[in-house]
């Protein structure tokens, strides 16, 4: 029959962080392989990974054509060596993915700080806006071009000397805090999508940036910037 | 200093599709900001339509979203309202208005801080 | 949605009085989302007041907000003869943003 032996794929599990989505199942293969196939819900069946060894599958380019759709995805299990054949009408074993909304579902993933300064009481903290892999016009979209206001950064800092933290909450990527003088001041923030009601509304915070642990930290406006 | 207009069939017929274009001036429309539409039924209060970013990231009124459609030209500093299957209940003075970042508590929020002079809609056969 | 009801519906005072306009919402509303807008007859609304007590630019400051929460007060010290209009308050914090019914002002 073409298909004797084979064990249809089980655990299938989106895997999707800043809208790079990728498929993962289960078990690893024994003399078989793998296709996947995926779709929206009034689209056409379109495979991928075509008789992969592997136990994942990259869907990206995919699901970046248009993230708030919903999508479906499986799995087809093919004996090890298998090539297409035209005779075969036997379909092979396969199992269904989740259904899958990449805007409501993605993880937020871990933002940056991309620089900060002090004029005075005043220090301006800039997170770092991410690209993503969805694009509109040939153009690759950041983070903030496909949440829009969706998105909110929360800012926590603290005094070097204590650890009492403070939070400011901001629609873009910017904030502009007050700060007292003389201090040095920590940082890190966290991404927000308020509107999600699931465990992926939030990132994991920044890494912490802190004034004045930093070469290229200038001592007149305490600025600080990273490269990436 | 930005300023908005905007323009479109000031009549429709029931069960056609209205459709509206605001023209930014004075300002890029890919400038950090917010585009909106808002409507006032006759003698009546505010009702948000929805928005939409530079990108092409939208957000709509629940109330309305299997109806409506904003979109974003760049290349002619305007974005648009598309209603379909419009009834007598979609007659009513039409704006748009810019959502611009405003200073706030240590962050930045956004506030329809301009706004076209409208344009009345009048759904009738 | 969250439903804000403005009182009263109207109010009718002279040239030089204190206005009091209140703004409640159906649920909880973070200030940083608060608006409050002037709106006069034939004219598009001006915005006067963000984040819920901010006056934005070119706002007099006879025009003051204040609340948070779910109560929400926009206060005209001493009313001029140009300040007879309509007032909205709206939030922008949750789809879909919606606004209050309004409230007119108008000569006594």
């Known amino acids: 029959s073409g298909t004797t032996n084979t064990v249809a794929a089980y655990n299938l599990t989106w895997k999707s962080t800043n809208f790079k989505t990728i498929l993962e199942w289960e078990p690893k293969p024994i003399n078989q392989v793998y296709t996947v196939q995926i779709s929206t819900k009034s689209g056409d069946w379109k495979s991928k990974c075509f008789y992969t060894a592997d136990t994942e599958c990259d869907l990206t380019d995919e699901i970046v054509k248009d993230v708030k759709q919903t999508y479906l995805a499986r799995v087809f299990s093919y004996p090890a060596g298998h090539v297409e054949s035209t005779g075969s009408t036997e379909e092979p074993p396969y199992e269904n993915s989740p259904e899958f909304t990449p805007y409501l579902e993605t993880n937020l993933g871990q933002p940056t700080i991309q620089s900060f300064e002090q004029v005075g009481t005043k220090v301006n903290v800039t997170v770092q806006d991410e690209w993503t892999l969805v694009r509109r016009n040939d153009t690759f979209l950041s983070l903030r071009d496909v949440f829009g206001k969706d998105l909110i950064y929360t800012l926590y800092y603290w005094k070097s000397s204590s650890s009492g933290k403070k939070t400011a909450k901001t629609n873009t990527n910017e904030f502009l805090i007050d700060v007292d003088k003389g201090e040095n001041y920590c940082f890190s923030v966290q991404a927000v999508i308020p509107s999600r009601r699931t465990a992926n509304r939030k990132s994991t915070d920044s890494p912490v940036e802190c004034m004045g642990h930093e070469k290229g930290e200038s001592r007149e406006t305490g600025h600080h910037h990273h490269h990436h | 200093q930005v300023q908005l207009q905007e323009s479109g069939p000031g009549l429709v017929k029931p069960s056609q599709t209205l459709s509206l274009t605001c023209t930014v001036s004075g300002g890029s429309i890919s400038s950090g900001q917010y585009w909106s539409w808002i409507r006032q039924h006759p003698g009546k209060g505010l009702e948000w339509i929805g928005e939409i970013y530079y990108s092409g990231s939208t957000r709509y009124n629940p109330s309305l979203k299997s109806r409506v459609t904003i979109s974003v030209d760049t290349s002619k500093n305007q974005f648009s309202l598309k209603l379909s299957s419009v009834t007598a209940a979609d007659t009513a003075v039409y704006y748009c208005?810019?959502?611009?970042?405003?200073?706030?508590?240590?962050?930045?929020?956004?506030?329809?801080?301009?706004w076209g002079k409208g344009t009345t809609v009048t759904v009738s056969s | 949605e969250i439903v804000l009801t403005q009182s009263p519906g109207t109010l009718s005072l002279s040239p030089g009085e204190r206005a009091t306009l209140s703004c409640r919402a159906s649920e909880s509303v973070d200030s940083s989302y608060l608006a409050w807008y002037q709106q006069k007859p034939g004219q598009a609304p001006r915005l006067l007041i963000y984040?819920?007590?901010s006056r934005a630019t070119g706002i007099p400051d006879r025009f003051s907000g204040s609340g948070s929460g779910t109560d929400f007060t926009l206060t005209i010290s001493r009313l001029e003869p140009e300040d007879f209009a309509v007032y909205y308050c709206q939030q922008d914090g949750v789809v879909p943003y919606t606004f209050g019914g309004g409230t007119k002002v108008e000569i006594k």
């Open positions: 984040g819920a007590d």
């Open positions: 208005a810019r959502d611009a970042p405003y200073y706030y508590g240590g962050g930045y929020y956004y506030y329809m801080d301009v």
